[in-house]
């Protein structure tokens, strides 16, 4: 009885109804169900379509632009549970731009376990105000139900019996309104006694077993549930899967051979995107969690000692990284079996992208070659590279080779980075911004000092266009306020003072004191530092009155730590010898200041002598908030309140329904229809700033959702004929 049909994979049914028949024997959809983009379908096409076996969807249900579909009551009459294990943009049920849908009609839907509901832009859709979503899901306040016919108060929603003057359906209170609850004119919403929680109840109102979810055919029997609250095993609902079973997809128990079959099917299929399932914490899951690696003999995830190794074998023994895309193919690799050639001419946000994809590499068995990578400023994106073995060498016996990198200024921050090169030599030619001191430092750190021959490191073509700072600038004065930092540093003059063009002050927010100069920089304009150009001070012949150059940094955030450094800007001297100076990176925190106002104050009186006041912290604390000040003042009573005859006829209903204390505004906004007196004399008040801001935020949120929806559902047609569903990357 429990899940009588098959377990089907997630489905994406689009363009026409042909594939809808694949749902015929499905009791459970393990994944999501998307039905969308059917522009030629008509109401009659759906008349005889019904899938009564479908009880549960484990991820989400999405309906988008399916023409002709007027109700879901016949299509999914027994859909009871949507688990929301994976959501579509935080939603488990999305009904969007369904132009002909008149009612939802999911009259057996009893539980949305995780996520909320988004029902938007369905201009024929009624029977929304008659649904009490709080009986189906917990996070009602996150529901987004707007721009439906229901909004315009044009719906004449009539629950069963109402036409005959009877009330057949249960009524519940939302926002102070006592309303009958139904899905259609012929289907009430089933409301179980509160003590049944989400387990469901029989038609007589007897609670289902605590392991049931949503409904059952007999009370208090875990084999008579319609769906399971926790896990399903051999016809009964169980709290947890007993040995030798494993939890699978958060809803059922499977044995080892089931998990093993999945693992081998994927391993043997070579199909991209499939998962080689493994076992961890009594679960059969797609892959080991971070920090674990699979033991191939028993599929168990075992903790890694240190970071988990992932050995990547390179075809033909080497790989050229010439774009972010090619770098992505090595994402997660910790050991490269082969050699890497980096040849990056351009790209967006390169430093961050390269670090995300190559930042875990610890070891390269062959050589590393950096060639004509005009976009690179630093190699610090190889954040974890510790060993180049040099088992295969570039022609000339080189294990590290850097040629013609026009903007390369730093190899690594050698104060924080260790690199060993087991065998092979270094080669550096035509790296005009790379100071020789950087190269010599690499020789020392990597253990290659003494291996190089005379022409391996070119003295004339490395660092010949760089300001190879050989002096340390010190900050002589640092003064902070809440939004400014005033800095001065010691004067610096090169041998020919005319060579000093000025100073460059670099700064950025730095919550942690772990910043390096080349973090986030590439030669294509990406730079996480804000840079200020500062003219040199007037030069005085009297050394006593030499001004310390400085800068007042303005417009900073209060109570925020900034990383700051300064360097000289000097011209290139004729002798190809460039002087310069640079400070260490210092960290300076701006002062605290007054916080912004506390947000969303709500007051409710819970007795004749008490007022409860709640609020949220300010959006800009601007320091450590230690306490709040609450001011109150007794106000004179409004005499009108005493003079009004409350028995007078014609008193209007309040224009706003009472809301329980501390219910979020959203839940009111999306779950109540407000009475508005449009016939009155009054004109509407102008919108307050906060209302305008809220509307802007809402419209921005709406756009974000629509962008997400379009990005996910519109996929290019597959050129090959295949029936596999698209994988739209649900969140």
């Amino acid at each position: 009885h429990l899940y009588p049909g098959e377990v089907c994979p997630g489905m994406d049914i689009r363009n026409n109804l042909t594939r809808l028949h694949e749902l015929e024997n499905c009791s459970v959809i393990e994944g999501h169900l998307q039905i969308l983009l059917m522009f030629k379908t008509r109401p009659e096409d759906f008349r005889d379509l019904s899938f009564p076996k479908l009880i549960m969807i484990t991820d989400y249900l999405l309906l988008f632009r399916v023409y002709g579909l007027e109700s879901l009551k016949d299509l999914f009459p027994n859909l009871t549970v949507i688990r929301g294990s994976r959501l579509f943009f935080n939603y488990a049920l999305v009904i969007f731009e369904m132009v002909h849908l008149k009612e939802l009609g999911l009259y057996n839907l009893m539980n949305i376990t995780r996520g909320s509901v988004r029902i938007e832009k369905n201009n024929e859709l009624c029977y929304l105000a008659t649904i009490d979503w709080s009986r189906i899901l917990d996070s009602v306040e996150d529901n987004y139900i707007v721009l439906n016919k229901d909004d315009n108060e044009e719906c004449g929603d009539i629950c069963p019996g109402t036409a005959k003057g009877k009330t057949n359906c249960p009524a519940t209170v939302i926002n102070g309104q006592f309303v009958e609850r139904c899905w259609t004119h012929s289907h009430c919403q089933k409301v179980c006694p509160t003590i049944c929680k989400s387990h469901g109840c029989t038609a007589e109102g007897l609670c289902c077993h605590s392991e049931c979810l949503g409904n059952c055919s007999q009370p208090d029997d875990p084999t008579k549930c319609v769906a399971c609250r926790n896990f399903y095993l051999d016809g009964r609902c169980v709290e947890t899967c007993p040995p030798p079973y494993y939890h699978f997809q958060d809803w059922r128990c499977v044995n080892f051979s089931f998990c093993q079959d999945l693992h081998h099917k994927c391993k043997n299929s070579r199909r991209q995107g499939c998962h080689q399932y493994v076992i961890h914490n009594n679960k059969c899951i797609p892959e080991c969690p971070s920090g674990y690696t699979m033991n191939s003999s028993n599929l168990l995830c075992t903790p890694c000692l240190g970071p988990c190794p992932k050995v990547c074998h390179l075809l033909e023994g080497e790989k050229t990284i010439d774009s972010v895309t090619s770098a992505q193919e090595l994402r997660g690799c910790t050991v490269i079996n082969g050699s890497l050639i980096i040849n990056i001419r351009g790209g967006n946000n390169l430093a961050a992208e390269l670090e995300a994809n190559l930042g875990l590499i610890e070891e390269i068995s062959g050589y590393l070659k950096i060639r004509r990578s005009y976009a690179l400023v630093s190699l610090s994106f190889f954040r974890k590279l510790r060993l180049i073995r040099g088992e295969t060498l570039e022609i000339g016996n080189y294990s590290f080779y850097a040629l013609d990198n026009q903007n390369l200024r730093q190899l690594w921050d050698w104060s924080k980075h260790n690199l060993t090169i087991t065998q092979g030599k270094l080669f550096f030619h035509y790296n005009p911004k790379l100071c020789l001191s950087e190269i010599h430092k690499m020789e020392e750190v990597s253990g290659t000092k003494g291996r190089q021959e005379r022409n391996d490191i070119a003295l004339k073509t490395n660092g010949d266009q760089a300001s190879c700072e050989n002096e340390l600038l010190k900050f002589s004065y640092i003064r902070t306020s809440f939004d400014k930092i005033l800095l001065r540093w010691e004067p610096y003059w090169p041998p020919d003072f005319r060579d000093l063009l000025g100073f460059m002050l670099f700064y950025k927010e730095a919550p942690y004191q772990n910043v390096t100069e080349f973090d986030g920089q590439d030669a294509c304009g990406s730079n996480s530092w804000t840079v200020v150009d500062i003219d040199p001070p007037l030069r005085s012949n009297d050394p006593k009155s030499q001004n310390h150059p400085g800068w007042l940094m303005r417009g900073l955030k209060p109570w925020t730590q900034y990383a700051i450094f300064v360097k000289t800007l000097v011209t290139f001297s004729d002798e190809r010898r460039t002087y310069g100076a640079k400070s260490d990176i210092i960290y300076v925190q701006t002062d605290a200041t007054n916080p912004s106002v506390p947000l969303d104050p709500i007051s409710v009186s819970n007795s004749s002598s008490q007022i409860i006041l709640k609020w949220k912290p300010p959006s800009d604390p601007n320091g450590n908030i230690t306490h709040y000040l609450v001011f109150w003042e007794r106000q004179a009573e409004d005499s009108e309140l005493f003079e009004l005859d409350y028995c007078l006829k014609g008193l209007k209903l309040p224009s706003r329904t009472w809301s329980p204390p501390f219910e979020s505004e959203d839940s009111q906004k999306h779950n109540q229809s407000e009475y508005e007196d449009s016939a009155g004399e009054c004109c509407s008040c102008p919108k307050t700033d906060s209302q305008i801001l809220k509307e802007l935020e809402e419209s921005s949120f709406r756009k974000t959702f629509e962008d997400y929806l379009h990005n996910v559902v519109f996929v290019p047609r597959k050129t090959s004929s295949g029936t596999g569903a698209e994988d739209p990357r649900p969140s």
Epitope: K474, Y477, I478, T480, R488, N547
Partner: antibody, heavy 113, light 107 residues
């Protein structure tokens, strides 16, 4: 040559007020902080606070907030320290300094009845 | 507030002696420390800024070192004009604070 000259010190009764002046010359007055520091007889140095002539922003040592106020007359390149509700323990030599590098000669304030 | 503790509070030395004065901060101040010399009836005079940089016109017998919380002022060969009181000052965070001073006297 940079010079800072304080004036306005003298004898004042407890509870009284006094305004000290710091006249600056020899540099661009608006670009550098003016700090005030005091030194009680035979004691160490104590920082009072700063004022930035570029925009008039100030910061005070919490100990002096409320009683001491900084102000400026940029046309005269002069900074002022207004001291109210003076106490005997405010007796000290008061210095103004251009960002710690140049100090005035100091002016003595004696609070006594 | 950051406390600066100087030691010793006074010392007697002869001309030509090497003199070391230490200044300990109650928390990390990086390298944001000045050393001043003050003679009776005079304003303080900067000797060293940023822990170790000699201000212009200051004789090279004065040197500073340290970082974090422990700092040192060294006079390599004491001269008659060096007998004075020496103060350290931190400018790492507000309020800026001085050490209590070290008086160097003639033995």
């Amino acid at each position: 040559e940079v010079q800072l000259v304080e004036s306005g010190g003298g004898l004042v009764q407890p509870g009284g007020s006094l305004r000290l002046s710091c006249a600056a010359s020899g540099y661009d007055f608006t670009n550098y902080d003016i700090h005030w520091v005091r030194q009680a007889p035979g004691k160490g140095l104590e920082w009072v606070g700063w004022i930035y002539p570029g925009d008039g922003s100030t910061k005070y040592n919490e100990k002096f907030k409320g009683r001491f106020t900084f102000s400026l007359d940029t046309s005269k390149s002069t900074a002022y320290l207004q001291m109210n509700s003076l106490r005997a323990e405010d007796t000290a030599v008061y210095y103004c300094a251009k960002e710690w590098a140049y100090w005035g000669q100091g002016t003595l304030v004696t609070v006594s009845s | 507030d950051i406390q600066l503790t100087q030691s010793p509070s006074s010392l007697s030395a002869s001309v030509g002696d090497r003199v070391t004065i230490t200044c300990r901060a109650s928390q990390d101040i990086g390298g944001n420390l000045y050393w001043y010399q003050q003679k009776p009836g005079k304003a303080p005079k900067v000797l060293i800024y940023a822990t170790s940089s000699l201000d212009s016109g200051v004789p090279s017998r004065f040197s500073g070192s340290g970082s974090g919380t422990d700092f040192t002022l060294t006079i390599s060969s004491l001269q008659p004009e060096d007998f004075a009181t020496y103060y350290c000052l931190q400018y790492s965070s507000s309020p800026w604070t001085f050490g209590q001073g070290t008086k160097v006297e003639i033995k």
